[in-house]
């Protein structure tokens, strides 16, 4: 039975040209995290494998940096980066947990962070 929950940074906004950290946290389970995949819609951004390290998709190499932790840093943001991002936790023995973050990249100089929320 999957008992874990994923806490994410929720709905967030950032300025065009700036950077943002995407963070998820898996709690309420003793399952071992084998790998975390970061995806944007159907595109793989990056992988953090617990044993082997990071893989950054070649098309995002210039704008994506590993970390902090299992998180992901997006740099040189454009308006086209607006959309849904998913952290997919591969765990053993529970299976897969998915968290969702919505990022809005703003043209203006004011970007406020949304509140945290949980996905069961």
């Amino acid at each position: 039975m999957m008992t874990g929950t994923i806490e994410t940074t929720g709905n967030i906004s950032a300025e065009k040209g700036g950077s943002i950290i995407l963070q998820c946290h898996l709690s309420s389970t003793t399952a071992q995290v084998t790998q975390v995949n970061w995806e944007q819609q159907d595109q793989l951004l990056a992988i953090c494998n617990a044993d082997l390290g990071w893989h950054i998709s070649p098309s995002f190499k210039d704008r994506v940096a590993p970390g902090p932790g299992l998180g992901l840093t997006l740099q040189s943001l454009t308006v086209n980066d607006t959309g849904e991002y998913f952290c997919i936790y591969h765990t053993y023995p529970d299976g897969t947990y998915t968290g969702r973050i919505f990022l809005e990249v703003l043209e203006s100089s004011v970007a406020e962070h949304g509140a945290r929320f949980q996905i069961p």
């Epitope: 071992q32 084998t34 790998q35 992988i47 494998n49 617990a50 044993d51 082997l52 390290g53 990071w54 893989h55 950054i56 590993p66 970390g67 591969h90 053993y92 023995p93």
Partner: antibody
């Protein structure tokens, strides 16, 4: 005590196949990802492949992708490496190794020789 | 893939000498740098992990330092059992990659 014991090496012709095994003991095998690392005679170390604890995730070095298949049988505490379309440059001692962000336990290795 | 370059490729030293081996990564690897010792006909043995941590049983004369792209393994006082080949390995970016090795020989 953690032990990893490889077997299945030998002499094989180019284009041939071989299956290596690694028997694990001294730890809960099903909780850990495991890798194969090889070393050509007189050369350095090269990571070959990795498999997750449950076997759902695998990675391969570009040099073996499409030719080698890593698998595991947790009920037998055994790791496998199926090697097809072998080339002379696959000649090496093959080690199984475990560890998170490091290889802290290694087997003694099994020698694979690809030659006609 | 990240290239790991060790120097020197070999060195001759005497018992009691202080020995330094360097490893350079082709891009930053944070502190995810491991060192291994290998003796002829044997499997590699982990000496240092994540730059400066020693597994239990590894003597304190072995130490690691550095960060980013440049790392060093130091043997403070070389012992007879330390004559071997030493490899660095990065575990920051997949695939894991090793240096070409440094052979420490008896002078």
């Amino acid at each position: 005590e953690v032990q990893l014991l490889e077997s299945g090496g030998g002499l094989v012709q180019p284009g041939g196949s071989l299956r290596l095994s690694c028997a694990a003991s001294g730890f809960t095998f099903s909780n850990y990802g495991v890798s194969w690392v090889r070393q050509a005679p007189g050369k350095g170390l090269e990571w070959v492949s990795w498999i997750s604890p449950h076997g759902a995730l695998t990675y391969y070095a570009d040099s073996v992708k499409g030719r080698f298949t890593i698998s595991r049988d947790n009920s037998k505490n055994t790791l496998y490496l199926q090697m097809n379309s072998l080339k002379a440059e696959d000649t090496a001692v093959y080690y199984c190794a475990k560890g998170r962000r490091r290889f802290d336990y290694w087997g003694q290795g099994t020698l694979v020789t690809v030659s006609s | 893939d990240i290239q790991m370059t060790q120097s020197p490729s070999s060195l001759s030293a005497s018992v009691g000498d202080r020995v330094t081996i360097t490893c350079r990564a082709s891009q930053t690897i944070s502190s995810y740098l491991n060192w291994y010792q290998q003796k002829p006909g044997k499997a590699p043995k982990l000496l240092i992990y994540e730059n400066n941590n020693r597994p239990s049983g590894v003597p304190s004369r072995f130490s690691g330092s550095g960060s980013g792209t440049d790392f060093t393994l130091t043997i403070s006082s070389l012992q007879p059992e330390d004559f071997a080949t030493y490899y660095c390995q990065q575990s920051y970016i997949i695939p894991p990659t090793f240096g070409q090795g440094t052979n420490v020989e008896i002078k």
